[in-house]
């Protein structure tokens, strides 16, 4: 089986987060860091409302996920720190008339971080 | 409320240049990606070029890429498109337009539109 | 570069007839499908985003649907205010791109 190569994060709002290299595709399917950082961009009214500080760290953890060459899937956020994030800044997106994205379905990611489901927690 | 007006249109010769402008209010620009859609005279809508809330990031249409600039001066609430070695098939409507969705881009505001025609 | 193409190019049709537009992404989009309306002379008005979520303020009579290539924008009864052109524009993956529009006229 061939080796996962990582790639480094070149998405500047993902970069100083703890980690720094990612695969594509992303959990949203984008094969290209160009094509996910377009869709990041329009998170930026939410990021600098406050709403939660787990915010950017989540997102990035979607579009960019941790990425390990002793792993073959990407490891994205955990459905305990979607659901925190949800909680806190739903209410702000609703207050911009947008809807929670059905992208980020707080259901398509593991409940928490174990040896057969690996997640950052946040 | 959200306004957006462009500026900046006219007439010029193919291979000359024009600076378009769109004065933004109503919203907090530095928060949102902007971009320039256009349209060519009884044509379909085609997106030219695209710029962070930061300014740090740029996307383009592969036809002007190497020949418009877009930037944004955030002191000004304004958004230009530079546009170099115009041919006649950049003769169109250009709207500027504040972009977000949240995941999704859209175009939620537009501006009325600023026309621009390369002709000898 | 994923191309948007959309049928029919135009339509006739009745106040109070069911409308149905059609968009056909050349590759999958999943849900990043976005509609607009636009009327002559004036700027397109976004009226649904990621495929089937009504913007703000749009009249409910609007609804889209779809996901991967196939996308769907109804008007579930034509109002007088509705004969426009539409364009369906996806957001997956630059360039973005939008279908050539569909123009509703009066029958």
């Known amino acids: 089986e061939e080796e996962r190569r990582c790639d480094p994060i070149r998405i500047s709002m993902c970069q100083n987060l703890g980690y720094n290299v990612t695969k594509m595709p992303n959990l949203v399917g984008h094969e290209l860091q160009t094509d996910a950082e377009l869709q990041l961009t329009t998170f930026t009214p939410l990021i600098q409302y406050g709403c939660s500080s787990q915010l950017q760290f989540f997102l990035c953890s979607v579009y960019v996920p941790m990425c390990t060459e002793k792993i073959n899937i990407p490891i994205g956020p955990c459905g305990g720190m979607c659901l925190s994030v949800k909680r806190r800044c739903e209410p702000v997106l609703k207050e911009f008339g947008f809807a929670w994205p059905e992208s980020l379905n707080c259901s398509k990611f593991p409940p928490q971080n174990d040896h057969n489901h690996m997640c950052m927690e946040g | 409320e959200v306004q957006l007006v462009e500026s900046g249109g006219g007439l010029v010769k193919p291979g000359g240049s024009l600076r378009l402008s769109c004065a933004a209010s109503g919203f907090t620009f530095t928060s949102y990606a902007m971009s320039w859609v256009r349209q060519a005279p009884g044509k379909g809508l085609e997106w030219v070029s695209a710029i962070s809330g930061s300014g740090g990031s740029t996307y383009y249409a592969e036809s002007v890429k190497g020949r418009f600039t877009i930037s944004r001066d955030d002191s000004k609430n304004t958004l230009y498109l530079q546009m170099n070695s115009l041919k006649t098939e950049d003769t169109a409507v250009y709207y500027c337009?504040?972009?977000?969705?949240?995941?999704?881009?859209?175009?939620?505001?537009w501006g009325q539109g600023t026309l621009v025609t390369v002709s000898s | 570069d994923i191309q948007m193409t959309q049928s029919p190019s135009s339509l006739s049709a009745s106040v109070g007839d069911r409308v149905t537009i059609t968009c056909r992404a050349s590759q999958s989009i999943s849900s990043y499908l976005n509609w607009y309306q636009q009327k002559p002379g004036k700027a397109p008005k976004l009226l649904i985003y990621a495929a089937s979520s009504l913007q703000s303020g749009v009249p409910s009579r609007f609804s889209g649907s779809g996901s991967g290539t196939d996308f769907t924008l109804t008007i579930s009864s034509l109002q007088p205010e509705d004969f426009a052109t539409y364009y369906c524009q996806q957001s997956y993956s630059t360039p973005l791109t939008f279908g050539g529009g569909t123009k509703v006229e009066i029958k």
């Open positions: 337009a504040r972009a977000t969705g949240f995941g999704t881009v859209v175009f939620d505001y």
